[in-house]
């Protein structure tokens, strides 16, 4: 009886199973009676990952330096290349197609997490007693300074975008 | 008992045609790929043509495409090869094999073709 | 065209003694490839298929091994009925090709 369902790592066709092609190779011409599938390696920047029946091989993806991408890892007969962005870039999707600028914290926010080459900047609002008075993607919030361990007093009180500023103490005469 | 008795070789002259036979038994024959297999003599094995099990695909070497019919006959439980404008290279023992596992995992006691004028 | 080169053309060796027969491929076909044993007078008969797999009413002294282009038949212990030629063939691509053939006879 011909059959109906292949094992693993094969394909039916003409009433018959075939082997399929190992990842980094592709399909030439099924298999027959007599002969096994014939299977042929990748080219040169072409690249299978699974075990397919595929007869073409996908180009590698190309790290466009004018969209922000260079190469993180070269691809091989069986993997696709992996770009990630420029130093101060990251990636606008996870397929990282085009990279934008990391996003600065403005003042009164500080970074919470650097941008990396896949993820941007993560800011987060400077909680009370804490302040940033710079639009920074690399700043955290600088904690208020305390007038008191300088033997200082308040004379202005801080926000989230200013440190309180210090004075002397007043004098009793 | 799987059985490959193959018949209708002889002494032909060249250009001449030939027609061998090969009857099968002890299998369902309808259900395996069949080969046709030569040995000039004192030489190697060498693939001669093949024929699907439904007879619908055939399979030739370049030195016998074009000369060489491989044929069956399902209710009959017979394989054939018609060998056309024969030449004094395809003397041979022509064996008849069946395709098992895609090997030839059962062959024929052979048939001489004698190729002389 | 796959071309199968067998060395040596003739083994020559004693009953008892271990036979190592070559195949090599002209180009990589997995572990596509049959192995036949030939007695003179006799239709071939099937010994190893793809490769390494033994064949049910063959001998244990039989074994197949190799991959991609170098394949080996191996012979453990020779016994009288061994002496014969043997060939590889393979069934990776069209058209199917079979070895020159390695003789093994009694030295």
């Known amino acids: 009886e011909p059959p109906t369902a292949c094992r693993e790592k094969q394909y039916l066709i003409n009433s018959q199973c075939c082997s399929l092609c190992q990842p980094g190779q592709k399909l030439v011409s099924d298999c027959t009676e007599f002969t096994e599938t014939e299977c042929l390696p990748c080219g040169e920047s072409e690249f299978l990952d699974t075990w397919n029946r595929e007869t073409h091989c996908h180009q590698h993806k190309y790290c466009d330096p004018n969209l922000g991408l260079r190469v993180q890892q070269k691809g091989t007969s069986e993997t696709d290349t992996i770009c990630t962005c420029e130093e101060g870039w990251h990636c606008t999707s996870e397929a990282c197609e085009s990279c934008v600028l990391h996003r600065s914290c403005s003042p009164g926010f500080g970074v919470k997490q650097i941008a990396t080459g896949v993820s941007d900047t993560i800011c987060e609002p400077c909680p009370v007693g804490f302040f940033s008075n710079v639009s920074s993607a690399f700043e955290k919030c600088h904690p208020w300074t305390s007038c008191e361990t300088k033997d200082l007093v308040v004379q202005q009180a801080g926000t989230n975008k200013t440190d309180v500023v210090c004075g002397p103490q007043d004098r009793l005469r | 008992e799987v059985q490959l008795v193959e018949s209708g070789g002889g002494v032909v002259q060249p250009g001449r045609s030939l027609r061998l036979s090969c009857a099968a038994s002890?299998?369902?024959?309808?259900?395996?790929?069949m080969s046709w297999v030569r040995q000039a003599p004192g030489k190697g094995l060498e693939w001669v043509a093949s024929i699907s099990s439904g007879g619908d695909d055939t399979y030739y070497p370049d030195n016998v495409k074009g000369r060489f019919t491989i044929s069956r006959d399902n209710s009959k439980n017979t394989l054939y090869l018609q060998m056309n404008s024969l030449r004094a290279e395809d003397t041979a023992v022509y064996y008849c094999t069946r395709a098992g596992g895609k090997a030839m995992d059962y062959w024929g006691q052979g048939t001489l073709v004698t190729v002389s004028s | 065209e796959i071309v199968l080169t067998q060395s040596p053309a003739t083994l020559s060796l004693s009953p008892g003694e271990r036979a190592t027969l070559s195949c090599r491929a002209s180009q990589s076909i997995r572990d596509n490839l049959h192995w036949y044993q030939q007695k003179p007078g006799q239709a071939p008969r099937l010994l190893i298929y793809?490769?390494?797999q033994s064949i049910s009413g063959i001998p244990a002294r039989f074994s197949g091994s190799g991959s991609g282009t170098d394949f080996t038949l191996t012979i453990s212990s020779l016994e009288p009925e061994d002496f014969a030629v043997y060939y590889c063939q393979q069934f990776n691509s069209w058209p199917l090709t079979f070895g020159q053939g390695t003789k093994v006879e009694i030295k």
């Open positions: 793809y490769a390494s």
């Open positions: 002890g299998f369902t024959f309808s259900n395996y790929g």
